[in-house]
């Protein structure tokens, strides 16, 4: 069997059924073109942070390489909520009602919802269980990530945004320790002075007393 590896979240929560129906939004595009500009061994972006060279963990997107093109496979997605999310018209309906809005084939469901089994309909994600952070054509919401034991929750999972996790106080994760949180250094080496405290993303920063040239421990 053929196929390529793709990294994504390993959630600890099992999904519940989606509640409510949502009006789908137009503007869906057709098939994916066979050339894209994403290159490199990894596209790392921690959930809840801006895109950039952040440390990856198992629940981070990486590049999935195809012969003809490369593109990002979604695990824990970049938390981009399109501005259209603010203007979504949600139908005030109770769980289990069988009403839905119809729309032409190929239209996308808004953030916070997913494709229903009923053509042209969207189901709302369940708060704290699943999310979609962009307009989508998915048959299910993406599962909320559970923070690891060495992490704390910076912000909870909502229907439009995945859980944001960060290292617990006194620990950090950077490019050199992508998989786990490491203990912050207790102090600077002899002849250096601390200029920056430890954060969840970096160790303490020290500079030489004489030169003022700084570096991370």
């Amino acid at each position: 069997a053929s196929g390529t590896e793709a990294a994504a979240a390993t959630p600890s929560k099992v999904w519940g059924s989606s509640a409510g129906r949502i009006e789908p939004r137009g503007g869906g595009r057709g098939a994916l073109p066979t050339s894209m500009g994403q290159h490199g061994p990894s596209a790392r972006a921690r959930a809840g942070r801006a895109p950039g060279p952040r440390p990856a963990r198992e629940a981070s997107p990486r590049l999935r390489v195809h012969k003809t093109f490369k593109f990002v496979v979604v695990g824990v997605l970049l938390q981009v909520v399109p501005s259209s999310a603010a203007t979504i018209k949600l139908h005030d309906q109770s769980i289990g009602t069988q009403q839905w809005e119809h729309s032409p084939l190929g239209e996308l469901c808004p953030p916070g919802s997913h494709r229903s089994e009923h053509p042209g309909a969207c189901n709302r994600c369940t708060e704290g269980v699943g999310y979609t952070n962009a307009s989508n054509n998915l048959f299910a919401c993406l599962p909320c990530t559970a923070c690891k034991s060495d992490e704390e929750e910076r912000s909870p999972c909502t229907t439009t945004r995945n859980t944001a996790c960060q290292c617990k106080p006194g620990t950090f994760r950077n490019d050199n320790s992508a998989e786990m949180c490491r203990k912050c250094s207790r102090g600077c080496p002899r002849g250096m002075v601390k200029v920056k405290d430890c954060t969840p993303w970096s160790d303490i920063e020290c500079v030489h007393k004489e030169s003022g040239n700084g570096h991370n421990i």
Partner: antibody
Framework: QVQLVESGGGVVQPGRSLRLSCSAS????????IHWVRQAPGKGLEWVAV????????YYADSVKGRFTISRDNSKNTLYLQMNSLRAEDTAVYYC?????????????????????WGQGTTVTVSS | EVVLTQSPGTLSLSLGERATLSCRAS???????LAWYQHKPGQAPRLLIY???SRATGIPDRFSGSGSGTNFTLTISRLEPEDFAVYYC?????????FGPGTKVDIK
């Protein structure tokens, strides 16, 4: 490498039950929708059921609805198909297949639908 | 349920010839949701095309897909010995997902 392996097939009498397993390796199992597809002797492919991502929404073909149940154990990287009230017409080779996955592109989440990884199949024979 | 009809049922061609396989849907299917598979006896099916026209990983460029609405086509530009098989179209446009009955491509 990326692969799916089915097991649990066999000969069973009409009305009885059977549970098929699909063991995955080489990829992050919980991130993909996994399908069951079958092929009866001398017939074409028939879609049976799917379970999306971490064990969320599941859908069934009308011919098996109410009799078959799809489930998954992400800790074991395994998908199951519980088949109850089996009929002669359920006789087939059963394949599990992975859906391609979800991509974030141009601010849209897209499922690029197509079963890109298949197991070799397990044979179920329903006969008295 | 979307019913897919494939034609012809069997296509007898020689090596190097062009094969054109048709898939017709009973109702409109978005081009994002139409896939093609190749299936050989004793083997697992193989994804060729998804989203109507995007080739799957490792699929040679002699395979191409096109179409929209209710009419879709798989084209094999020059038949190679390994291309003789049964080809299925499949739709993801609406549930239940369905396959066509298949087109068998055999050697003339």
């Amino acid at each position: 490498q990326v692969q799916l392996v089915e097991s649990g097939g066999g000969v069973v009498q009409p009305g009885r039950s059977l549970r098929l397993s699909c063991s995955a390796s080489g990829f992050t199992f919980s991130s993909y929708g996994i399908h069951w597809v079958r092929q009866a002797p001398g017939k074409g492919l028939e879609w049976v059921a799917v379970m999306w991502y971490a064990g969320s929404n599941e859908y069934y073909a009308d011919s098996v609805k109410g009799r078959f149940t799809i489930s998954r154990d992400n800790s074991k990287n395994t998908l199951y198909l519980q088949m109850n009230s089996l009929r002669a017409e359920d006789t087939a080779v059963y394949y599990c297949a992975r859906d391609q996955g979800v991509l974030l592109r141009f601010g849209e989440l897209r499922g690029y639908y197509g079963m890109d990884v298949w197991g070799q199949g397990t044979t179920v024979t329903v006969s008295s | 349920e979307v019913v897919l009809t494939q034609s012809p049922g069997t296509l007898s061609l020689s090596l190097g010839e062009r094969a054109t396989l048709s898939c017709r849907a009973s109702q409109s299917v978005s081009s994002s949701y139409l896939a093609w598979y190749q299936h050989k006896p004793g083997q697992a099916p193989r994804l060729l095309i998804y989203g109507t026209s995007s080739r799957a990983t490792g699929i040679p460029d002699r395979f191409s897909g096109s179409g929209s609405g209710t009419n879709f086509t798989l084209t094999i530009s020059r038949l190679e010995p390994e291309d003789f098989a049964v080809y299925y179209c499949q739709q993801y446009g609406s549930l239940p997902f369905t396959f066509g009955p298949g087109t068998k491509v055999d050697i003339k």
